[in-house]
Interface confidence: medium
């Protein structure tokens, strides 16, 4: 949560001299209350915009817009405090609009905008516009708040932003998962144009339940340049566990721009309509790690053998 770096923060408009200042989120009027205070904003509108930084990066920003009520209290309006709170971290950022001239009624309703709060994909924010001075302790509140959920990197508009591109948003693995038989899943996906490894996490669940009954991790080594953009397939051996029939496959890439924090893509296979009791697996790969040498995968908690191929 930060302010867009290079923009001159402007809030002046015809009939009003105004300056934007950084704020500690604790306006002086909290400490020294005034007798006469303005009413609250009439409406707050928030939407997502994409702006470029001075380094040419595209970043998601909140576009905040609000209007004033048409009452006489605007004569006592000295400015506004804009606060953005990131809900999952409690991080808060504030700016203050300081009016350098008195507001007067004019033929149109007063409208203010601010588009400089840089936000993160897939995060929820609470945006508050507080008119200044703030009310006396028992006075009517003169602020309005609204929550806004920033879309995740799957969203078309977000996909092209720098934070999303850094986390691998342009990679579309187009995962397909096919049940070969009661014991095997085939996973196909498209490799990206980078020589980096991938990890496939298979998580299985009982029908209609959300606690996992089985997990298996499969490692895919970095493809060679001639394999970029090609389809890769992996056959995962399932655990012969009763009712453990709904399978979620998650692919995690390790691109250089995001390392352990790259966007993961998932696909799910539902339980069959009438699940038959699976036959015992006749022959397993061992639970143990290989005793000598090394394999190109390690399994998490299963006896599942798995192998992969790249298709040109």
């Amino acid at each position: 949560l930060r302010l867009l770096d290079h923009r001159a923060l402007v809030c002046s408009q015809p009939g009003l001299n105004c300056t934007v200042k950084n704020s500690t989120c604790l306006d002086d009027s909290w400490i020294h209350p005034r007798n006469l205070t303005p009413s609250s904003p009439k409406n707050i509108y928030i939407n997502l915009s994409v702006s470029s930084t001075q380094h040419g990066e595209l970043v998601p920003v909140l576009h905040v817009e609000w209007t004033l009520q048409t009452d006489a209290s605007i004569l006592y309006l000295e400015g506004a405090e804009l606060s953005v709170l990131q809900l999952n971290t409690n991080e808060r950022l504030c700016v203050r609009f300081e009016f350098l001239s008195k507001l007067r009624h004019h033929h149109r309703r007063w409208r203010f905008t601010f588009s400089h709060f840089v936000v993160d994909p897939d995060q929820e924010y609470e945006v508050t516009v507080h008119h200044l001075p703030k009310p006396i302790p028992d006075g009517d509140p003169n602020h309005q708040s609204k929550n806004f959920l920033v879309p995740d990197c799957e969203h078309a508009r977000m996909k092209v932003t720098t934070p999303c591109m850094s986390s691998g948003s342009l990679w579309d693995p187009n995962i397909t998962v096919e049940t070969l038989d009661t014991q095997h899943l085939r996973v196909d996906f498209t490799l990206w144009n980078e020589s980096t490894h991938y990890q496939i996490l298979l998580t299985s669940f009982p029908h209609m339940e959300n606690h996992s009954c089985f997990e298996h991790m499969h490692h895919i080594p970095a493809p060679r340049p001639e394999e970029f953009h090609q389809r890769s397939n992996v056959t995962l051996t399932l655990r012969n566990l009763k009712g453990c029939c709904r399978h979620q496959v998650q692919i995690q890439p390790f691109f250089s721009s995001c390392l352990n924090d790259c966007l993961r893509h998932s696909a799910t296979v539902s339980c069959p309509e009438m699940p038959d009791t699976p036959e015992p697996i006749p022959d397993y790969m061992p639970l143990w790690e290989p005793r000598s040498g090394s394999s190109d995968y390690k399994d998490d908690d299963d006896k599942g053998s798995s192998h992969h191929h790249h298709h040109h």
Epitope: L201, G243, D301
Partner: antibody
């Protein structure tokens, strides 16, 4: 070599909580889940639950649901098991073990005594 | 839940003799069964998994057999270090369950 080293013995009063740690070494922590098994004095083994060190998914024994919480700290390759509202019949040796279904490596055990 | 029943509770055997331990499941567990050995004051040690596969470092005198509901752990020639308690465990269905144990003692 693979090692699971558990925290030391604890004496708790009924109603209190205990948190046992299990530090893994000798392998990639997030490749294998951690299970917890306990053994009351002179009794057999009882499965308590499991946590995925990769996804954080958990699966707890029904009888402990609501009282037990399993967590991991991947930065230190440590798994934790917290048991709340302790009763005298929770007195046991608590073991962490590697893997979800079948346990190939075990910690040395942590004796938790619940007594007023 | 699947109940695992081990028999006998105690088995008295002389060193060098064969020991046969039994484990029965209340319903089929396929081949998803493990055997562990535990000595006093120690953590369990894995012996057999998938009903018949020996764990790393386990001597050949230990063997497992069976599938479905009936399983057997056989120690072909008991050594002094084999006197311990043996547990079976199913991992075919949640919750995972252990048998009550068989104590193998010196006759």
């Amino acid at each position: 070599q693979v090692q699971l080293v558990q925290s030391g013995a604890e004496v708790k009063k009924p109603g209190a909580s205990v948190k046992v740690s299990c530090k893994a070494s000798g392998y990639t922590f997030t490749r294998y889940g951690i299970s917890w098994v306990r053994q009351a004095p002179g009794q057999g083994l009882e499965w308590m639950g499991w946590i995925s060190t990769y996804s954080g998914n958990t699966n707890y024994a029904q009888k402990l649901q609501g009282r037990v919480t399993m967590t991991t700290d991947t930065s230190t390759s440590t798994a934790y098991m917290e048991l709340r509202s302790l009763r005298s019949d929770d007195t046991a040796v608590y073991y962490c073990a590697r893997r979800q279904l079948y346990f190939d490596y075990w910690g040395q055990g942590t004796l938790v005594t619940v007594s007023s | 839940e699947i109940v695992m029943t081990q028999s006998p509770a105690t088995l008295s055997v002389s060193p060098g003799e064969r020991a046969t331990l039994s484990c029965r499941a209340s319903q089929s567990v396929s081949s998803n069964l493990a055997w562990f050995q535990q000595k006093p004051g120690q953590a369990p040690r894995p012996l057999i998994y998938d009903a018949s596969t020996r764990a790393t470092g386990v001597p050949a005198r230990f063997s497992g057999s069976g599938s479905g509901t009936d399983f057997t752990l056989t120690i072909s020639s008991l050594q002094s270090e084999d006197f311990a308690v043996y547990y079976c465990q199913q991992y075919d269905n949640w919750p995972l369950t252990f048998g009550g144990g068989t104590k193998v003692e010196i006759k």
